[in-house]
């Protein structure tokens, strides 16, 4: 007999990168007839909602209308259908941006490289911080963390046209509370190979996620997402 | 010390092919892309191309596209240019540099003569 | 392809001036600019990377500056053996391009 029902699926939109004092919605996905569904954060319970008709709703949305230092972190739901309960989600990790100021992120050797040359990006930023993020725009999005006190250095070690796109860094005091986005670098890989072994694993986002967090920062629109696997938060822990 | 060792000069006839080395040493031939770059006859630099010596990707200057042609031989931490259908207008010093961010390191240089 | 304009085109100089070189890109480079140094009869030489980060070895009478597309490269005091040729380098895109040269000589 089944003890426990599926694991809800939990997202933010219109992205989980949230300037603050925007508006943010916290979205869970579970089962028709769900009677229950209980948003948890860092742990606790957060947010409870009960969707009437429950045999026509799958989906519930937990609306945070002032996004702030205090509302970034880890989320979870689960829903309940009669007296089972689910599963708890994965852990969606909320992040606020704009808590300092922009970084400058820059490339070496140059945003122009060959095919095989050994390419670094450098996240620079003055005011006092810890923690560097380094992201790809795009569907196929790369995350990485850099740590230093005023500069990180992320190598991408030999890159590939796979590599190519734009890039921007953030500055960070902690997992959850970023800087403004630096300026975008734009990343050309040239060159044709015989050998194409070296192209990265890169982690994937099912929709550009950038491009929504984009809207988020200049019109604070809206804008409805596929829900994705989670691989970007897992990068963030 | 970084070492960028290139062949002696040469002095050819028009229409002719020609192949210049550039031997390096002291650093990882694999870990930095090779550039070439011609020096006419009192004038400024021009950049021909480069390549990546781990994998052999190349990029050139379309200006030398059908000209030059880059590779290099892993084994013995060499690059070379090879130049083909030449004309007077190929008569020039070409060196190889590292590129290191910038061109941090060059070739002493080699004098092409191209004369009938 | 970004053109790389150098001016003077010819400096001519005591020792002990400070003197400043001129280097314009036809389109923004960020700091992807590159000085280098090229004596008579010898292969260039780097001076300042990135527009304005020293080099080991090069005399500190050597900097740079600028960023975008107007750079300077400066000699605080010009020693005899600063003769020579001075090119600026666009490291941003391919293809990469070099100024047309500044020639330093003494008066």
């Known amino acids: 007999q089944q003890q426990t029902l599926p694991k809800p699926f939990i997202w933010a939109e219109p992205h989980f990168m949230v300037p603050k004092e925007k508006q943010v919605t916290i979205c869970c996905q579970g089962n028709y007839g769900a009677v229950e569904y209980q948003l948890h954060f860092e742990g606790s319970l957060f947010a409870v909602d009960r969707p009437k008709p429950p045999e026509r709703i799958n989906k519930v949305k937990f609306y945070i209308p002032d996004m702030n230092s205090r509302m970034a972190g880890q989320y979870s739901c689960i829903y309940r259908v009669g007296e089972l309960w689910s599963e708890p989600s994965n852990l969606l990790d909320l992040v606020v941006t704009e808590m300092a100021d922009t970084p400058t992120l820059s490339v070496h050797p140059g945003p122009e490289v060959i095919s095989g040359e050994k390419v670094t990006f450098y996240c620079r930023l003055d005011t006092a911080t810890s923690m560097f993020l380094l992201l790809k725009e795009g569907r196929s999005s790369h995350v990485q963390r850099g740590y230093g006190k005023v500069q990180a250095e992320f190598p991408l070690g030999p890159v590939t046209t796979a590599h190519r796109g734009t890039y921007r860094c953030f500055g960070s005091a902690n997992n959850h509370a970023w800087s403004f986005p630096s300026e975008p670098v734009k990343l050309l890989v040239t060159g044709d190979i015989e050998n194409t072994s070296l192209a990265p694993e890169d982690p994937t986002f099912p929709a550009d996620t950038w491009g929504t967090y984009l809207l988020t920062t200049e019109t604070g629109l809206q804008k409805d997402h596929a829900l994705w696997d989670h691989t970007a938060q897992n990068l963030l822990r | 010390e970084v070492q960028l060792q290139q062949s002696g000069p040469e002095l050819v006839k028009p229409g002719a092919s020609v192949k210049i080395s550039c031997k390096t040493s002291?650093?990882?031939?694999?870990?930095?892309?090779m550039h070439w770059v011609k020096q006419s006859h009192g004038k400024s630099l021009e950049w021909i191309g480069g390549?990546?010596?781990?994998?052999?990707?190349?990029s050139y200057n379309q200006k030398f596209k059908g000209k030059a042609t880059l590779t290099v031989d892993k084994s013995s931490s060499t690059a070379y240019m090879e130049l083909r259908s030449l004309t007077s207008e190929d008569s020039a010093v070409y060196y190889c540099?590292?590129?290191?961010?910038?061109?941090?390191?060059w070739g002493q240089g080699t004098t092409l003569t191209v004369s009938s | 392809d970004i053109v790389m304009t150098q001016s003077p085109a010819t400096l001519s100089v005591t020792p002990g001036d400070r003197v400043s070189l001129s280097c314009r890109a036809s389109?923004?480079?960020?700091?992807?600019l590159h000085w280098y140094q090229q004596k008579s009869h010898e292969s260039p030489r780097l001076l300042i990377k990135?527009?304005?980060q020293s080099i080991s070895g090069i005399p500190s009478r050597f900097s740079g500056s600028g960023s975008g597309s107007d750079f300077t490269l400066s000699i605080n005091s010009v020693e005899p053996e600063d003769v020579g040729v001075y090119y600026c380098q666009n490291g941003h895109s391919f293809p990469l391009t070099f100024g047309a040269g500044t020639k330093l000589e003494l008066k």
């Open positions: 389109q923004s480079i960020s700091d992807y």
């Open positions: 990135y527009a304005s």
């Open positions: 002291g650093y990882t031939f694999t870990e930095y892309t």
């Open positions: 390549i990546s010596p781990n994998i052999g990707g190349t």
């Open positions: 540099a590292r590129r290191g961010g910038s061109f941090d390191y």
